[in-house]
Amino acid sequence: MMTGTIETTGNISAEKGGSIILQCHLSSTTAQVTQVNWEQQDQLLAICNADLGWHISPSFKDRVAPGPGLGLTLQSLTVNDTGEYFCIYHTYPDGTYTGRIFLEVLESSVAEHGARFQIP
């Protein structure tokens, strides 16, 4: 039975040209996290595997940095980065948990950054 829940940074906004941290946290389960995938729509951004470490997709290498923790930092944001982002936790024995974050990249300087937190 899957008892875990994923907390995310929810809906966030950021300025064009800036950077933002996408963060998820899996709680309420003792399942072992074997891998976390970060995806934008159906496109793979990055993988963090407990054994193999980080892999950033080649097409995002210049603008995506691993961390902090199992999170992902997006840099040099453009309005095209607006959209849904998913953290997909692969766990044993529970299976897969998915969290959703909506990022809006704004042209103006009035962007309000959503709450951020780090995994200790």
């Epitope: 993988i47 054994d51 193999l52 470490g53």
Partner: antibody
Framework: EVQLLESGGGLVQPGGSLRLSCAAS????????MSWVRQAPGKGLEWVST??????????YYADSVKGRFSISRDNSENTLYLQMNGLRAEDTAVYYC?????????WGQGTTVTVSS | QSVLTQPPSASGTPGQRVTISCSGS????????LYWYQQLPGTAPKLLIY???QRPSGVPDRFSTSKSGTSASLAISGLQSEDEADYYC???????????FGGGTKLTVL
């Protein structure tokens, strides 16, 4: 150019020891996952051992068939990967390749031959 | 014995499309990324496909993959004589903490 060059293979008696070396050029071994993979004569590929990049937990992993007998290590100043092989058995006879990479091994050496026979 | 099962041999004529299968348990294939290696006669293996479907630079798009349920396959279209080689599928097993290779498939270009 990114290259790997293995050495240290040879003929050894059962129960004996060998140390294989893998000299890297064009990249720094401590920054990457490094593995040893072997291939017995006329057979397929068999994973032997992997060491993680020093930036990621610094783990080492071994196949059950070599656990307790083989040890993977690296010398960062020499930019070289090693495989210390003790208690060698006839079934360890193979070409031993070192390889670089975590999400797929994208650079391989040419291999060094280890023969275990009395 | 390998956790990943491949046919020992496959063949085709120049220009043809050939496929090489790789099968395993649902856990192995379905929830893990698959990798493919090519080993030309007398040479070291070469990474052909990583993360299920990604080709390293220099690998032609004649090589493609698919994955469904408990099996996966490597397809080679427009077969060429230089494609004659051994092909291996592989995956990283998070529970064994190690790489698992298929037994390999010897591809002959007739």
């Amino acid at each position: 150019e990114v290259q790997l060059l293995e050495s240290g293979g040879g003929l050894v008696q059962p129960g004996g020891s060998l140390r294989l070396s893998c000299a890297a050029s064009g990249f720094t071994v401590s920054d990457h996952y490094m593995s040893w993979v072997r291939q017995a004569p006329g057979k397929g590929l068999e994973w032997v051992s992997t060491t993680s990049s020093t930036s990621w937990k610094n783990y080492t992993y071994y196949a059950d068939s070599v656990k307790g007998r083989f040890s993977i290590s690296r010398d960062n100043s020499e930019n070289t990967l090693y495989l210390q092989m003790n208690g060698l058995r006839a079934e360890d006879t193979a070409v031993y390749y070192c390889a670089k990479g975590s999400y797929g091994m994208d650079v391989w050496g040419q291999g060094t031959t280890v023969t275990v026979s009395s | 014995q390998s956790v990943l099962t491949q046919p020992p041999s496959a063949s085709g004529t120049p220009g043809q499309r050939v496929t090489i299968s790789c099968s395993g348990s649902n856990f192995n294939i379905g929830t893990k990324y698959l990798y493919w290696y090519q080993q030309l006669p007398g040479t070291a293996p070469k990474l052909l496909i990583y993360l299920d479907s990604q080709r390293p630079s220099g690998v032609p798009d004649r090589f493609s993959t698919s994955k469904s349920g408990t099996s996966a396959s490597l397809a080679i279209s427009g077969l060429q004589s230089e494609d004659e080689a051994d092909y291996y599928c592989a995956l990283w097993d998070d529970h064994l903490h190690g790489w698992v290779f298929g037994g390999g498939t010897k591809l002959t270009v007739l």
